[in-house]
Every structure is written in structure tokens, then in C-alpha cells.
């Protein structure tokens, strides 16, 4: 059957009609509407927004729009017993206290229910002790402290600057180092770009601004009390002691005004090198403890937050496919915010809203996509990707059989310099082809394609004339679809110039100052970057849902597999003596990659030549493409991370935000020289090479001729 069944629009016109219907002015209106009050997960305000979105998606023309609710573990500050940090003197008197809230931005002074800065899921506690400054609290920072500087963090309160890695990894590292509390702060070196004013006069972080965020180490588990299964009405919940990923020590975030007061008194060891110095006028001494005059003073944390099982609501909209209704292309982004969500998530949610409206307009004109499109407004992303993960757990059997692709739609912007894309290699060609057809919104690129401006501003480090596309890591709602279920996934947003702006993320991330005005005044007054992101995300969904042959190129997977094999081999070869002693061979992996490359090449040739008018053969070839990502899933998961099951990609064990290739081998090799039993450690390296080689070979065979 034709892909235009039940349509009255020609195929070429379809995509153009869809893209032409997307309007910057609508995205602007939707963003304003979504950002006037806080929409914290588990609150009445966020439930009301869910119902509003449900109603509007129905009006836009979707076939059905349902709320899917779950009862998950969330975390809130105690309203009557605020969290703060003190400096106490030898008598125990509090001689300095950190602020209890961020000064509200202009126009928002009377808004209620602004949650004060807190580290979600911190346990309660009032530890007191000496401070140790641990830089970014990365694995390598603790190696420097413990191994090189011989500084012991056991029984200390550590203070770490935000940035570089996911905050949950910082807390995990501090726990492993024996710390009894963690203070997180935003250093101007990372969150204040030179030459830009602080909010409300610019997009920089003021001294009283604080980054909220969860500090879990869930490793893909979803709700901490129901790992692997949906948190539904009849769920069996673990006790809090058995919950997944909860921190064991109190944690609290502060701004740089308060951090100055703590850091200016630091004594002990000097910073090991300039990479440990931020931009505050303090020595950045490591400690432990305060300098001479203040050596009897200590730091005390007061944390009274509570963990509570709370109802959350996803909105799931369906646009039924005309030809293959049992094949799902999913566009999803979260709705919950820490406060107003001016960028995170509502700049993304507004784009999804406009994409739904455009699809709905086409549907009202008689068009349908070839495949079913599912639209999702996820809840509780900020509390650990909970809404998306619970829904995927509930629908895992359908998704693993029917899921074609997942496109993520969190923040549309983190800057206004160029496009940023992270996706499966299967989508590289789709993204290249699409961006060649879209107009660049960038100054100086009038009349040029998005592909051209993107490639010029963010070139691929390997291939000249092509743009950089990054690996998927985690820290967003694609995680369960890609890392657990093996559904081809991608994400796109506009980003900053990473060359000139070394700060982490965007300065006002997760603060009260992330408002509509931040976007409208400073980031995207014309909403042209939002429109471009809508065109990229929407265009990807359109092509994935409507092209007769799925727009996946398996040859691009072959190219990256070889690159990743080369990389992990070179890491391993840094230990030549042990490689020789334990006879470590990569032959099986390189051989599997070679086979994959040859089989992928032959499959691509068949894909050009087969009879596309034969629906059985078409479906067969498309299924081979759809299930290729699935073939990289190991049902047993990665060591100690059962919900990270993708053998080629996983979130880095040292930074949830970053993707690691061949993660099983990488983790087996990491810090291997420090392992107490080298024979066992190198045995695990060999086992992981075996698992990787087998998986690549097995994936290759799914692309072979079926009989």
C-alpha cells in the first residue's frame, strides 16, 4: 500500500506542509503560558498543567490523549524547618548562616510555592566538621586528593563546585571517600560568562542564585522503590533502606555569595594546580579545616527534607498511523520544572506543543502518518527520569516489539550559537539530510542551510565537511528507551559556543531566574532558534513516521563501531605488560566489527534494490532496521547496572551526562593498575571483550539475508 493511504497530500508536500505550519509566534505564546507559575513534580499546579495539555492536544486533533499516573518517591524540603548551612564557633554558636531562598526575580515577588534550593533525596542530618574543598568532586579530583596529596576526606564535610559531571556522581564519589556531608556550589568560573551581566540585566548567575537538582545514582532504575516495574496501584514497594540510588549523607546547594564565606577561611593544603581555582577572591585551599585564626570554627549542615511517595502524571497523545499503526515513533519531553522552567523544560515543551498542533492541522486536512506517532509530556524528570521510566516499564512489551524511534524534547536551547545533536548512528544520515533542507537561523548564514552553519561552527573532529554528532549519555528522558530497551533515539537543541564559553551548562540552570523573560530578552527574542529546533525535532519525527523505508543507515553504525573498537583497544594497550602476561586479544572484537561492516554494506545494497511495492518484503527490511538497535541490548545488563543494557553505549560511570562507548570493557579497564587482584581484573577485561564481540556479531547477523 502507498504511504499516502488515507491522505490527500502528496508525499513531498507533506513534510513541507508540516514544517510550514510551525510558527515561532506560537512557540513564544506556549512558552509564556507554561512559565507563569512553578510546575514542580507532584504538585497540584503540575497536575493542572497536565490536564491543560491533555485538553489542548485533543483540540489540536490527536486521536486520543490520556493521563498515565504513577505513585513514585519524590523529595521536598520541610516547609517549617528550612535547610541551611552554618559556620559555628567553638561554643557551637552559629556565626554565619547560608540564605534560605533565592531573591525572587522582578515581577515574581508575590509568586507562591517557589521551592527553596535543595538537593532532592538528601537524607536528613546535621553533620558538623571540618571542610575539604574537592574541586568538581570528579573521580580524578578524589584521586588527586587521596593518592597525590594524601588528604583524607573521611569524617569531613566536602565542598564541591558544580559543573563538568552530573551532581549525583559527585555525591557518590564523596560518599566513597568517607565524607559525612556535601556542599555543592556554583562558581563564577563555571556559571558567570565574562562580559555578561547577571540576571535580570543579563543571562549570568547572580551571587544569590542556586542550582537545584536530584543527587540520585539510579543507573536507569526509575522510581527508587519499584525498580524494573511500574509504580502502579498494586505495586510492591521496597523499604527505604533498600531503595535504589539514594544518597547516604546530607547534601545541600548554595550560591557563590555564600560559598565565598565558606571558602575564604579555608586553610590546610594549597590547591594542587590552577585547574582547582575558580573565579572567587579566595585561595581555593583544599583544607582540611579553616586557616589559623578560624581553626576552631566548624561547618554544620541542617537538612530536614523528606522523601514522600507522590502521584505524578504523564500525558500520552496518539496519532494513529494509516499503514503501520503497530509501529511507534515517540516524541517526548518533560513538563515538570524546579521553578518556572523558562528553559528547562518549557522551551522544549512549547516546541512539542507546536509540533503536535502542526501534526493535528495536517490530520484535520485528511492526512495521517504511515506509522503511529506517540507524543509524551513526562512528569518527574527532575527527580530521576521517573515519569518516562515508569511508563516505559509499564509498556515495555509493546515498546520492545513496536518501538521504531524516540526523539527527546527537553530544553530547546542552552545557548544560541549552533545546533547540537546527540543520537544513535542509525540517525546520522537522517539528521544530515534534514538539516540540509532547513534554513539556518544564524546571523551571517542568511540563505544558507542549517547543515552549513552547523558544520562551520561545530565541525566533526573526524570527517571534514560534516558536523559533530555526539554519543547519547543520560540525564534525560531518552534513557529508558535507548539504554534499557534499545530503541533508536536522538535529541537536538541549540547550544552555546563551547570554544569560548567554558562554563557548565547555562548559568541560570535550575535556578529561580530561569524565566520566560530570560528567554525572550536574552536568548531568543525572535524565537527563531526555537523554531529551528522545532523543525529539526518535528522533521525527524515526520520522516521516521512517514518514510516508506525507515531512514536508518546501518553503515554508519559500522563506522563508529570500528572507531570505538580502535579507542578501547588503545586504552587497553596502555598496559602492554599485562596485555602480554594475560594474553589479552582483541581479535574477536575486530573480527566481529569487520563482519558487521561487510554485512551492513550488503544489507544497504539490498535496501536500494528490493521491490518496495511488496508490503511483506518492505516490512521485513524495515523490521531488520528497527530491530538493529535492539540487537545491541544484552538482557543481563552491564556489571552492577542491570538497567543499562546497551553494549555499545552507556552513561559514563563517572558522569551520567556523558556517553561511554563499549562501557563494559571501559569500566573493566578503568584504574585497573590499582586493583588488588590483577589476574581477576584482566580476566574481567577478557570477559567484557567477549561480550562485546559476541554482541556485535549477533547484531550483524540480524542484518543478514533471513534465509
Amino acid at each position: 500500500k502507498s504511504s499516502n493511504e488515507a491522505t490527500n497530500i502528496t508525499p513531498k508536500h507533506n513534510m513541507k506542509a508540516f514544517l510550514d505550519e510551525l510558527k515561532a509566534e506560537n512557540i513564544k505564546k506556549f512558552l509564556y503560558n507554561f512559565t507563569q507559575i512553578p510546575h514542580l513534580a507532584g504538585t497540584e499546579q503540575n497536575f493542572q498543567l497536565a490536564k491543560q495539555i491533555q485538553s489542548q492536544w485533543k483540540e489540536f486533533g490527536l486521536d486520543s490523549v490520556e493521563l498515565a499516573h504513577y505513585d513514585v518517591l519524590l523529595s521536598y524540603p520541610n516547609k517549617t524547618h528550612p535547610n541551611y548551612i552554618s559556620i559555628i564557633n567553638e561554643d557551637g554558636n552559629e556565626i554565619f548562616n547560608t540564605s534560605l531562598f533565592e531573591p525572587p526575580p522582578p515581577g515574581y515577588e508575590n509568586v507562591s510555592d517557589i521551592v527553596p534550593p535543595f538537593s532532592a533525596f538528601s537524607p536528613q542530618g546535621m553533620p558538623e566538621g571540618d571542610l575539604v574543598y574537592v574541586n568538581y568532586a570528579r573521580t580524578e579530583d578524589f584521586f588527586k586528593l587521596e593518592r597525590d596529596m594524601k588528604i583524607n576526606c573521611s569524617g569531613k564535610i566536602v565542598i564541591a563546585r558544580y559543573g563538568k559531571v552530573f551532581r549525583g556522581n559527585k555525591v557518590k564519589n564523596a560518599q566513597l571517600a568517607g565524607a559525612k556531608g556535601v556542599i555543592l556550589y556554583s562558581d563564577p568560573a563555571d556559571y558567570f560568562a565574562p562580559g555578561v551581566k547577571s540576571y535580570p540585566d543579563g543571562w549570568n548567575l547572580p551571587g544569590g542564585g542556586v542550582q537545584r537538582g536530584n543527587i540520585l545514582n539510579l543507573n536507569g532504575a526509575g522510581d527508587p522503590l519499584t525498580p524494573g516495574y511500574p509504580a502502579n496501584e498494586y505495586a510492591y514497594r521496597r523499604g527505604i533502606a533498600e531503595a535504589v540510588g539514594l544518597p547516604s549523607i546530607p547534601v545541600h546547594p548554595i550560591g557563590y555569595y555564600d560559598a565565598q564565606k565558606l571558602l575564604e577561611k579555608m586553610g590546610g593544603s594549597a590547591p594542587p594546580d590552577s585547574s582547582w581555582r575558580g573565579s572567587l577572591k579566595v585561595p581555593y585551599n583544599v583544607g582540611p579545616g579553616f586557616t589559623g585564626n578560624f581553626s576552631t570554627q566548624k561547618v554544620k549542615m541542617h537538612i530536614h527534607s523528606t522523601n514522600e511517595v507522590t502521584r505524578i502524571y504523564n500525558v500520552i497523545g496518539t496519532l494513529r498511523g494509516a499503514v503501520e499503526p503497530d509501529r511507534y515513533v515517540i516524541l517526548g519531553g518533560h513538563r515538570d520544572s524546579w521553578v518556572f522552567g523558562g528553559i528547562d523544560p518549557q522551551s522544549g515543551a512549547a516546541v512539542v506543543h507546536e509540533i503536535v498542533r502542526s501534526f493535528g492541522t495536517l490530520k484535520k486536512e485528511g492526512w495521517r502518518p504511515r506509522r503511529t506517532i506517540l507524543f509524551a509530556s513526562w512528569d518527574a524528570e527532575e527527580f530521576g527520569l521517573l515519569g518516562s521510566t515508569e511508563w516505559a516499564e509499564e509498556n515495555s512489551r509493546l515498546l520492545q516489539e513496536r518501538g521504531v524511534a524516540y526523539i527527546n524534547a527537553d530544553s530547546s536551547i542552552e545557548g544560541n550559537y549552533t545546533l547540537r545533536v546527540d543520537c544513535t548512528p542509525l540517525m546520522y544520515s537522517l539528521v544530515h539530510n534534514l538539516t540540509k533542507e532547513l534554513k539556518s537561523p544564524d546571523e551571517g548564514f542568511e540563505g544558507k542551510s542549517l547543515y552549513e552553519s552547523w558544520t562551520k561552527k561545530s565541525p566533526s573532529p573526524e570527517f571534514s565537511g560534516m558536523p559533530r554528532i555526539s554519543k547519547l549519555g543520560s540525564g534525560n528522558d531518552f534513557e529508558v528507551f535507548f539504554q534499557r530497551l534499545g530503541i533508536a533515539s536522538g535529541r537536538a537543541r541549540y547550544t552555546k559556543n563551547w570554544e569560548t564559553n567554558k562554563f557548565s551548562g547555562y548559568p541560570l540552570y535550575h535556578s529561580v531566574y530561569e524565566t520566560y523573560e530570560l528567554v525572550e530578552k536574552f536568548y531568543d527574542p525572535m524565537f527563531k532558534y526555537h523554531l529551528t529546533v522545532a523543525q529539526v525535532r518535528g522533521g525527524m519525527v515526520f520522516e521516521l513516521a512517514n518514510s516508506i523505508v525507515l531512514p536508518f543507515d546501518c553503515r554508519d553504525y559500522a563506522v563508529v563501531l570500528r572507531k570505538y573498537a580502535d579507542k578501547i583497544y588503545s586504552i587497553s594497550m596502555k598496559h602492554p605488560q599485562e596485555m602480554k602476561t594475560y594474553s589479552v586479544s582483541f581479535d574477536s572484537l575486530f573480527s566481529a566489527v569487520k563482519n558487521f561492516t561487510e554485512i551492513a554494506s550488503k544489507f544497504s545494497e539490498r535496501l536500494q534494490d528490493f521491490d518496495k511495492s511488496n508490503p511483506i518484503v518492505l516490512r521485513m527490511m524495515n523490521d531488520q532496521l528497527m530491530f538493529l538497535e535492539r540487537a545491541f541490548i544484552d538482557p543481563l545488563g552491564l556489571p552492577d547496572r542491570p538497567f543499562y543494557r546497551h553494549v555499545i553505549y552507556a552513561p559514563s560511570s563517572h558522569n551520567k551526562y556523558a556517553g561511554e562507548s563499549f562501557p563494559g570493557i571501559y569500566d573493566a579497564l578503568f584504574d585497573i593498575e590499582s586493583k588488588v587482584d590483577p589476574s581477576k581484573a584482566w580476566g574481567e577485561v577478557k570477559r567484557q571483550i567477549y561480550v562485546a564481540a559476541f554482541t556485535v556479531q549477533a547484531a550483524a547477523e540480524t542484518l543478514s539475508e533471513v534465509a
Epitope: 572507531k563 580502535d566 594497550m573 602480554k580 589479552v584 569487520k594
Partner: nanobody
Framework: QVQLVESGGGLVQPGGSLRLSCAAS????????MSWVRQAPGKGLEWVSS????????YYADSVKGRFTISRDNSKSTLYLQMNSLRAEDTAVYYC??????WGQGTLVTVSS
């Protein structure tokens, strides 16, 4: 069976250059990453450099970065190591290695005035 034969070693003055070669046979050379490893007198094995399937993907130890260049010619099944600005501490037996199992016999490089 896999064979790796190094050549090109010798005596060279500090600041001088040498080009090592490694002729490979017994396997599909282009399908495998390759490495150079060295062993200084009385010391353990030290990884020097690795290369992927083409001359785009290369990796170097910090001690040789900017001075040594690894390359390969897949049509000749040969691996190369161009060594410039040689120092006394580069004196070692240089091995061509496919992985932990397949190594050449090594070629001696002596840097001395």
C-alpha cells in the same frame, strides 16, 4: 599464522630521526588496530602509540606526543613509526604489537652522542 617483523632501528644522535617499519602477514591487516610498544634497558614495557584502521585515528603516550608519528599502509600491510627529535630516554627495543598475544621480535633504537 600471524607474523610481525620490525625494521629500521639503529644508532642515532640526540635530536635525530628514525623511521621504524613493521611488515605484517597472516591476517587481514586493515581490519585491526596496531601498536608500537617499547622496552628501555632494565625497564618494563611501555606503550608508545596506536593506530586505528586508517590514519585518522591515532593515539600517543604523553612522552612521545608531538615527536613521534604512527601511520600505516594497508595496501602494503605495513605499520610505521616516524621518530623525530629523539632523546636519550627514547633508547629501547621497539616492538610492533597487534594486541597482547601477537608481537614482533623488536628492533633496537639507541639514541646517543
Amino acid at each position: 599464522q600471524v607474523q610481525l617483523v620490525e625494521s629500521g632501528g639503529g644508532l642515532v644522535q640526540p635530536g635525530g630521526s628514525l623511521r621504524l617499519s613493521c611488515a605484517a602477514s597472516g591476517f587481514t591487516f586493515s581490519s585491526y588496530a596496531m601498536s608500537w610498544v617499547r622496552q628501555a634497558p632494565g625497564k618494563g614495557l611501555e606503550w608508545v602509540s596506536s593506530i586505528g584502521d586508517n590514519n585518522r585515528t591515532t593515539y600517543y603516550a604523553d612522552s612521545v606526543k608531538g615527536r613521534f608519528t604512527i601511520s600505516r599502509d594497508n595496501s602494503k600491510s605495513t605499520l610505521y613509526l616516524q621518530m623525530n627529535s629523539l632523546r636519550a630516554e627514547d633508547t629501547a627495543v621497539y616492538y610492533c604489537a597487534k594486541d597482547g598475544v601477537h608481537w614482533g621480535q623488536g628492533t633496537l633504537v639507541t639514541v646517543s652522542s
